[in-house]
């Protein structure tokens, strides 16, 4: 806590400008009016304040807004955002996507910090659901964002938002998460034709049930091995050799190199040797 001291004569700040970088911490506390700071927050980022000076500016805003900052201030926090604690952020009510983008930009290139996680949580809860624009924004900054959500949180994602999801956004999702996302993707893409549908649904297939895989096998989709290896074992096991052959097309040749790995290993063990022999790969059940 900075001690309350009177502002020296002639040092009262009329505006937020570069001259303030020469102020000592106590001078900033005494000479910068919190209301002035709040209205000119957009200038703070252009001035090379030290971390200690930023601490003083934050303290002034905390005093002015003990219940939490208004969005007009939050949007212009810039690097001051890095000084905020999750407790500070929980007091905020962020509703504008522009505000969210501005703060995520500050943290760009770094891991998701507790502050950012809290900010996103507040924003999404405020909106009531993870809409397409929000998802677009979040996955652009954090490709792994979607897979960091629990299945319960993912259940609030409307099918329309699925259009914003890119294949790399699902790279770290586990089967439980894909179980939630797959039905939404199926609904979102249901009006697309066969080949276009497969391109879109492919990344979500780790949540697909057996009957959907059987249906895909009738559509000449040529699923690659990387996708096949991510399918649920329990969904793959009931597939016949003929269905797997149709599902994979030319990619079926890749089964040999994967014969010791799940789900291929478990699937092979379920098949009749005569059927496996038809694949021409020397697979042993």
């Amino acid at each position: 806590e900075v001690e309350k001291t009177a502002c020296p004569s002639g040092k009262k700040a009329r505006e937020i400008d570069e001259s303030l970088i020469f102020y000592k911490k106590w001078e900033l506390e005494a000479c910068v009016d919190a209301a002035l700071l709040a209205t000119q927050m957009d200038r703070v980022n252009a001035i090379p304040f030290t971390y200690e000076q930023l601490d003083v500016l934050k303290h002034k805003l905390d005093e002015l807004y003990p219940q939490g900052y208004p969005e007009s201030v939050i949007q212009h926090l810039g690097y001051l955002f890095l000084k905020m604690s999750p407790e500070d952020i929980r007091k905020w009510n962020v509703t504008s996507l522009e505000t969210l983008k501005a703060l995520l930009e500050v943290n760009k290139g770094h891991e998701m910090s507790p502050q950012v996680a809290t900010l996103i949580d507040r924003f999404v809860k405020g909106r009531g659901q993870l809409d397409k624009d929000t998802l677009d924004t979040l996955t652009a900054f954090y490709p792994g964002y979607l897979c960091s959500l629990s299945p319960e949180e993912l259940s609030s994602v409307p099918p329309s938002s699925i259009w914003a999801v890119r294949p790399q956004d699902l790279d770290t999702c586990d089967p439980r998460q894909l179980d939630v996302l797959y039905p939404k993707a199926r609904l979102a893409f249901q009006n697309m034709n066969g080949s276009e549908y497969f391109v879109k649904i492919q990344s979500f297939l780790g949540g697909a049930p057996t009957e959907d895989l059987k249906a895909l096998s009738q559509q000449n989709v040529s699923m690659d091995l990387a996708t096949f290896m991510k399918l649920r074992t329990d969904a793959v096991l009931p597939l016949t050799v003929a269905e797997v052959q149709k599902l994979l097309g030319p990619h079926v040749e890749g089964l040999k190199a994967e014969e010791r790995h799940r789900p291929v290993r478990d699937w092979i063990l379920r098949q009749r040797q005569d059927d496996l022999d038809t694949l021409g790969l020397g697979l042993q059940g």
Epitope: D224, L225, Q245, P250, H251, V252, E253, G254, K256, A257, D277, T278, L279, G280, L281, G282
Partner: antibody
Framework: EVQLVQSGAEVKKPGASVKVSCKAS????????MHWVRQAPGQGLEWMGN????????YYNERFRSRVTMTVDKSTSTAYMELSSLRSEDTAVYYC??????????????WGQGTTVTVSS | DIQMTQSPSSLSASVGDRVTITCKAS??????IAWYQQKPGKAPKLLIH???ELQPGVPSRFSGSGSGTDFTFTISSLQPEDIATYYC?????????FGGGTKVEIK
């Protein structure tokens, strides 16, 4: 010892067809798909397609799909590649090749000696 | 289809020189690339698979490196018997594709 022995050189007229054979020995024929690769004079290698020797299902390079037919005869462990509607640019050496499935879709570790097909009027 | 762009198309080097050939894939192929040597009138001979794994009996002067889309094949000290054309092959996709080849000659 694994061996792939191909049929002899052929000279064909434009518009005709050619059928090249590749007899495999030294391994279980039905455990490895057979691939065909061609090489025009002074040019690079071009993958033409492959065939499952167990039930004869082929997959072709789009470039040849309308003109190529790959077949197998399991009883003699022989693979065949037939190319129809021949033109001068089909003059090339045609190779059969067997993949090794150590990783992914497999690289070619054994090759036939090649069959020269000359298309000339 | 995956395109494999190989360079240079030809090179001339002295015995003992270090020779480097590159192959660039049009999409990520992990490390699924093989390198072949082909001498006139002969079938290609496998030298390296999975980017850097040397085939048994292949001299250690041959090596490979890379991953994703960019790959390098190196002959650390060129020998007269290395005069040949070298090809890369991607097998990350069942529809295999070769690079255009690099003809290596002695100065």
């Amino acid at each position: 010892e694994v061996q792939l022995v191909q049929s002899g050189a052929e000279v064909k007229k434009p518009g005709a067809s050619v059928k090249v054979s590749c007899k495999a020995s030294g391994y279980t024929f039905t455990n490895y798909w057979m691939h065909w690769v061609r090489q025009a004079p002074g040019q690079g290698l071009e993958w033409m397609g492959n065939i499952n020797p167990s039930q004869g299902g082929p997959y072709y390079n789009e470039r040849f799909r309308s003109r190529v037919t790959m077949t197998v005869d399991k009883s003699t462990s022989t693979a065949y590649m037939e190319l129809s509607s021949l033109r001068s640019e089909d003059t090339a050496v045609y190779y059969c090749a067997r993949p090794y499935y150590g990783s992914s879709y497999g690289y070619f570790d054994y090759w036939g000696q090649g069959t020269t097909v000359t298309v000339s009027s | 289809d995956i395109q494999m762009t190989q360079s240079p198309s030809s090179l001339s080097a002295s015995v003992g020189d270090r020779v480097t050939i590159t192959c660039k894939a049009s999409q990520d192929i992990n490390k699924y690339i093989a390198w072949y040597q082909q001498k006139p009138g002969k079938a290609p001979k496998l030298l390296i698979h999975y980017t850097s794994e040397l085939q048994p009996g292949v001299p250690s002067r041959f090596s490979g490196s890379g991953s994703g889309t960019d790959f390098t094949f190196t002959i650390s000290s060129l020998q007269p018997e290395d005069i040949a054309t070298y090809y890369c092959l991607q097998y990350a996709n069942p529809l295999r594709t070769f690079g255009g080849g690099t003809k290596v000659e002695i100065k």
